[in-house]
């Protein structure tokens, strides 16, 4: 069985839908990004206990590694987080979803290392240019997601202090050659391009020279286009709620989507005494969906007024776009009014929350 080879580039804090079982989803993140992997239950049925595994070893939750039954979040990703991730059923170890994650060096903002490699008097009487930090110039190919900032650096020295100029694909490169311009930081021997786009792909050459000689280094930039993805829902929303009979309740859902999302609020219901259809998928009714005059902001909140015991149950925020769907659910527990609780306590009854 061949593995899927689609290269999916995911922007910051992007939740990645789980691939079909048997397919390996190949994902690229920038360092510092939040890696979010999502593995919905196959067939929509109950998932059972799951474990997340990286390179064959079970992942241990921490402040940076957040593990849930259907989702894994790795905050502030670094190169060490690259590897093969899978979500498995705990008992059978059956692989439900499989991801290949690569964390690329996120280019710096262009400002965070200012002053590090400024031209210095090396004490050499005279001499041709040379690289002062060649170990920092090893990475000749840079692949970054679109909209990131790229910084190429060629720290050098010589006497007299050499000049630096830049070429793109062998031709002189100036700010007017790209939308958004460029920043040339001669003191830091750097070229900075903000918010890169696919047309920025190419070979970038720094030329460092003085009257005694010339050296050059070429970097290749590949700009990875963000592939469209299904909507992303903010973790933890909607949140479970407990309310007293007759009170008002609000569920919140925060949706991020490149393509225009279609948001719905669903209530899980019973039909003929069953919570699921013949095929095991939960019965739902649509409580709220987009209207001609409804804003996305309004749709991100479900308000329930004067709640009754019938309002208790499971609610789902469902967001869909042309690519697919994402959903998060929460429970509403409705408690009797306080005076009823008091009466019940006096009668010796016990309520389990």
């Amino acid at each position: 069985e061949s593995l899927g080879t689609e290269q999916r580039v995911v922007g910051r804090a992007a939740e990645v839908p789980g691939p079909e079982p048997g397919q390996q989803e190949q994902l690229v993140f920038g360092s510092g990004d939040a890696v979010e992997l999502s593995c919905p239950p196959p067939g929509g049925g109950p998932m059972g206990p799951t474990v997340w595994v990286k390179d064959g070893t079970g992942l241990v939750p921490s402040e940076r590694v957040l593990v849930g039954p259907q989702r894994l979040q790795v905050l502030n990703a670094s190169h060490e987080d690259s590897g093969a991730y899978s979500c498995r059923q705990r008992l059978t170890q059956r692989v439900l979803c499989h991801f290949s994650v690569r964390v690329t060096d996120a280019p710096s903002s262009g400002d965070d290392e200012d002053g590090e490699d400024e031209a210095e008097d090396t004490g050499v009487d005279t001499g041709a240019p040379y690289w002062t930090r060649p170990e920092r110039m090893d990475k000749k190919l840079l692949a970054v997601p679109a909209a990131n900032t790229v910084r190429f650096r060629c720290p050098a020295a010589g006497n007299p202090t050499p000049s630096i100029s830049w070429l793109k694909n062998g031709r002189e490169f100036r700010g007017e050659h790209r939308i958004g311009g460029i920043k040339l930081r001669h003191q830091q021997w750097s070229l900075v391009m903000e918010s890169v786009v696919p047309s920025d792909r190419g070979n970038y050459t720094c030329v460092v020279e003085n009257k005694f000689g010339s050296i050059r280094q070429t970097y290749t930039l590949d700009v990875l286009e963000r592939s469209p993805h299904r909507p992303i829902l903010q973790a933890g929303l909607p949140a479970n709620q407990t309310a007293v009979l007759g009170s008002d309740v609000e569920f919140h859902c925060k949706v991020y989507s490149d393509a225009q999302p279609h948001i719905q609020w669903l209530k899980h219901v019973e039909v003929n005494g069953s919570k699921v259809g013949p095929d095991g998928t939960p019965y739902v009714t649509v409580l709220k969906t987009a209207g001609a005059n409804t804003t996305d902001k309004e749709l991100e909140v479900l308000s329930l007024h004067n709640v009754t015991f019938e309002d208790a149950g499971e609610y789902t925020c469902l967001a869909g776009n042309s690519i697919g769907f994402s959903h998060h659910s929460a429970w509403l527990v409705v408690l009797p009014a306080e005076e009823e609780l008091v009466e019940a306590d006096e009668a010796g009854s016990v309520y389990a929350g």
Epitope: G277, T281, V286
Partner: antibody, heavy 126, light 110 residues
Framework: QVQLVQSGAEVKKPGASVKVSCKAS????????MHWVRQAPGQGLEWMGW????????NYAQKFQGRVTMTRDTSISTAYMELSSLRSEDTAVYYC???????????????????WGQGTLVTVSS | DIALTQPASVSGSPGQSITISCTGT?????????VSWYQQHPGKAPKLMIY???NRPSGVSNRFSGSKSGNTASLTISGLQAEDEADYYC??????????FGGGTKLTVL
């Protein structure tokens, strides 16, 4: 973009069966319900039923119960509709239509058809 | 067995506005805000024009609008154009969660 491509026209004899295919592309096949709707010559649209490509679950209109079978092959993103015991009044254009129903749920009274196949003409004639 | 009632035909001149009605019961149109409308040109597949009573999919002209009052949904086309000439169908649900269509309305642009 989303595309539903149906199989070609069929001519069948009364009593025979016909199987129409609908190949989906441009979206995640298992995320949306697939419906079948038919239209007899000069008549209106008639809903036949749906299949949930994710679970394989089906729901058929009362009129077609016992005669229609909807199946899918997720490996090739294709849905199928088979109608048996054909009679002349089954002569119609048969459409597959993607329903805006998320396939992880069974909806009560909700959804619409946001993409349609080009239609397959099935002629039943002796 | 058509569950929703539409006029068999309506007509209008270019630039005019026309309205097509779709009448059901409290078990279908009246019970849910989930009526949709489809346009069908001769020999072509239907095309979604309005969903959830009044929403337009992207790519559909804002000359098309939908509304609902009680058990009757309506499709209004303003600034009528020759290419609007087609059949129009409404769609909703019945209490068995079955999809129901209207009988269709033939729109003629004079």
């Amino acid at each position: 973009q989303v595309q539903l491509v149906q199989s070609g026209a069929e001519v069948k004899k009364p009593g025979a069966s016909v199987k129409v295919s609908c190949k989906a592309s441009g979206y995640t096949f298992t995320s949306y319900y697939m419906h079948w709707v038919r239209q007899a010559p000069g008549q209106g649209l008639e809903w036949m039923g749906w299949i949930n490509p994710n679970s394989g679950g089906t729901n058929y209109a009362q009129k077609f119960q016992g005669r229609v079978t909807m199946t899918r092959d997720t490996s090739i993103s294709t849905a199928y509709m088979e109608l048996s015991s054909l009679r002349s009044e089954d002569t119609a254009v048969y459409y597959c239509a993607r329903g805006y129903w998320y396939a992880y749920f069974t909806y009560i009274n909700y959804g619409y058809f946001d993409n349609w196949g080009q239609g397959t003409l099935v002629t039943v004639s002796s | 067995d058509i569950a929703l009632t539409q006029p068999a035909s309506v007509s209008g001149s270019p630039g005019q506005s026309i309205t097509i009605s779709c009448t059901g019961t409290s078990s279908d149109v009246g019970g849910y805000n989930y009526v949709s409308w489809y346009q069908q040109h001769p020999g072509k597949a239907p095309k979604l024009m309005i969903y959830d009573v009044s929403n337009r999919p992207s790519g559909v002209s804002n000359r098309f609008s939908g509304s609902k009052s009680g058990n009757t949904a309506s499709l209004t086309i303003s600034g009528l154009q020759a290419e609007d000439e087609a059949d129009y169908y409404c769609q909703s649900y019945d209490n068995n969660s079955d999809v129901v269509f209207g009988g269709g309305t033939k729109l003629t642009v004079l």
